[in-house]
């Protein structure tokens, strides 16, 4: 189902962008990118 | 003192479940990422996952559906559920902040 | 995956020693960690970002390299960096991959 793929796709991006602030704070220490609370 | 303390190990039948508690002191964590990182006996470090400022957690895939990370920030504690235990989850389970300050580690023992 | 080299070293103090750490792919950002680890304890952070160093961590020690290949090197070792040593890549699909570790025992 097409909606089915769209939201995997987009689960997929966000857990890759949230991953690329992670390894950035962690093994980059780069504080400024940390995510706030929501 | 700043530290992290992890709790809830001990032995588990397999298929059980254990949760285990990471609580903070000397330091609010409200603003880290949290990670949890576990070892077998005799072996190397295995990540299993992180929980951010917002409470969206993410994980390693092997993983992801057993293992659940949550956080209680009024309570500064971070916390790693885990379901349907295997033998090959015998380790010592860390948590830490960022990855620069680390608990002492629990030890989770699934044997019957 | 990251696969470290050797997988034991022994050395006496004074003695220089450099760790390998190769990456199937490239690791993402540079974000390469390195980790010492004694037993029963946890591990403790030495550098970040593939070659610098953690607050407090002395100063022989020192990391290299980029892409796929990463080196650790202490310069001269002391009795207290007997230790198993771990690097740590960034992974944006699995987020961090540890390698095997490096056991550094004394000769």
């Known amino acids: 189902h097409s909606d089915g793929i769209f939201t995997d796709s987009y689960s997929r991006y966000r857990k890759q962008m949230a991953v690329k602030k992670y390894l950035a704070a962690v093994l980059g220490k780069r504080y400024k990118q940390r995510v706030k609370n929501k | 003192e700043v530290q992290l303390v992890e709790s809830g190990g001990g032995l588990v039948q397999p298929g059980g479940s254990l949760r285990l508690s990471c609580a903070a002191s000397g330091i609010d964590l409200n603003s880290y990422y949290m990670t949890w990182v576990r070892q077998a006996p005799g072996k190397g470090l295995e990540w299993i996952g992180f929980?951010?400022?917002?409470?969206?957690?993410y994980y390693a895939s092997w993983a992801k559906g057993r293992f659940t990370i949550s956080r209680d920030n009024s309570k500064n504690t971070v916390y790693l559920q885990m379901n349907s235990l295997r033998a090959e989850d015998t380790a010592v389970y860390f948590c830490?902040?960022?990855?620069?300050?680390w608990g002492q580690g629990t030890l989770v023992t699934v044997s019957s | 995956q990251l696969t470290q080299s050797p997988s034991t070293l022994s050395a006496s103090v004074g003695d220089r020693v450099t760790i390998t750490c190769q990456s199937s792919?490239?690791?993402?950002?540079?974000?390469l960690a390195w980790f010492q680890q004694k037993p029963g304890k946890a591990p403790k952070f030495l550098i970040y970002?593939?070659?610098k160093l953690e607050s407090g961590v002395p100063s022989r020690f020192s990391g290299s390299g980029s892409g796929t290949e990463f080196t650790l090197t202490i310069s001269s070792l002391q009795p207290d960096d007997f230790a198993t040593y771990y690097c740590?890549?960034?992974?944006?699909?699995?987020?961090?991959?540890f390698g095997g570790g490096t056991k550094v025992e004394i000769k």
């Open positions: 929980i951010d400022a917002g409470g969206d957690a």
């Open positions: 830490a902040r960022d990855l620069d300050l």
């Open positions: 740590a890549g960034g992974d944006i699909s699995e987020g961090v991959a």
């Open positions: 792919e490239s690791v993402y950002g540079n974000y």
């Open positions: 970002e593939a070659s």
